[in-house]
């Protein structure tokens, strides 16, 4: 019988509010034994896969997706999914990357540290929670 795969988690370092031109790293975490982590942006059809998986703890593996110089086009909702043979997991919650213009330059520390995706309120008519997706480092391909 196939095991029930836990949903992955997603976080962003140094945070989810990133000054223009600074770097951000998305961290996807799942159980041990993950073969591939996938970072999806806006739609399942736009994603980046990596098999560069490391062990974060005895029970957890992780992969890191870095954007070196964030542009406005990188803002948006991201989520993770992983493949642990023989099946894919469910998706993590979405994590929104916000890109802000800053006069402080690329090393400005004006970020939200250690942000990760958590429970979200059901959208109401006043919650508009989608932002511009990334164009850098993600590819549009047929999914799965």
């Amino acid at each position: 019988q196939e095991e029930d795969l836990p949903r992955p988690s997603i976080s962003a370092e140094p945070g989810t509010v990133i000054p223009l031109g600074s770097h951000v790293t998305f961290v996807c975490r799942g159980p041990v034994g993950v073969q591939t982590f996938r970072l999806e942006r806006e739609s399942r059809s736009t994603y980046n896969d990596t098999e560069d998986v490391s062990q974060a703890s005895p029970s957890e593996s992780e992969a890191r997706f870095r954007i070196d110089s964030v542009s406005e086009g990188n803002a948006g909702p991201y989520r993770c999914i992983y493949y642990k043979p023989p099946k894919w997991s469910e998706q993590s919650d979405y994590l929104e990357l916000l890109v802000k213009e800053t006069s402080g330059g690329p090393d400005s520390p004006d970020t939200e540290p250690g942000s990760s995706a958590g429970p979200t309120q059901r959208p109401s008519d006043n919650s508009h929670n989608e932002h511009a997706p990334a164009s850098q480092g993600l590819k549009a391909e047929h999914l799965y």
């Epitope: 806006e42 399942r44 989520r79 998706q91 979405y94 995706a117 959208p123 989608e130 932002h131 511009a132």
Partner: antibody, heavy 119, light 107 residues
């Protein structure tokens, strides 16, 4: 707060038509708007989506050549349809799509606008 | 292109009974699935999203389960007002495909 479709009506075969989805009481700024149609007695059929934040457009494969989804303002999205045939006769709905957790939430649908293709 | 296959096409059940509707995706869609109820002359009404999350205001008699490619909608303690057509949908904005529908008749 709602979204309302307009622009439907009777069109001759091979004609063109532009439908409008207008937000009332909010703007679409950080949402996606999607068009779905439903022929009489049939099920809903996804046509296209427009992401306000990324300006990305997404189409069903059958719709790419004759349908164009676009933003005309922060509160309106249009669907341009060309080379219409009787098979395009349907009620056309627009839906506002949010994000909830790790999934999309198609929670707000307009009442629909009827498009009839006939000579 | 993703295809959503829904079964059965129609079902008849008694008041107070339970029905199960199945939806199969041709590719893995994770939890990107919604269920709708539709009555004549109305737009689809969202019942369940993210495969199993009940929309606000929808009775708990409606429940959804599944992930990946196999999904189920269960309606228990059936009422006359449940007579309608039910659809599943891939909620990804790059796909959006609907199932063919299940017509529920209450006797």
């Amino acid at each position: 707060e709602q979204s309302v479709e307009s622009g439907g009506g009777l069109v001759q075969p091979e004609g063109s038509l532009t439908l409008t989805c207008k937000a009332s009481g909010f703007d679409f700024s950080r949402n996606a708007i999607c068009w779905v149609r439903q022929a009489p007695g049939k099920g809903p059929e996804w046509i296209a989506c427009y992401s306000f934040s990324s300006s990305a457009t997404y189409y069903a494969s059958w719709a790419k050549s004759r349908f164009t989804i676009s933003k005309t303002s922060s509160t309106t999205v249009t669907l341009q349809m060309t080379s219409l045939t009787a098979a395009d006769t349907a009620t056309y709905f627009c839906a506002r799509v949010d994000i909830y957790g790790g999934s999309r939430y198609w929670g707000m649908w307009g009442p629909g606008t009827l498009v009839t293709i006939s000579s | 292109e993703l295809v959503m296959t829904q079964t059965p096409a129609s079902v008849e059940a008694a008041v107070g009974g339970t029905v199960t509707i199945k939806c199969q995706a041709s590719q893995n869609i994770g939890g990107d699935l919604a269920w709708y109820q539709q009555k004549p002359g109305q737009p689809p009404k969202l019942l369940i999203y993210r495969a199993s999350t009940l929309e606000s205001g929808v009775p708990s008699r409606f429940s959804g389960s599944g992930s990946g490619t196999e999904f189920t909608l269960t309606i228990s303690d059936l009422e006359c007002a449940d007579a309608a057509t039910y659809y599943c949908q891939d909620t990804d904005i790059g796909s959006g495909a609907f199932g063919g529908g299940t017509e529920l008749e209450i006797k």
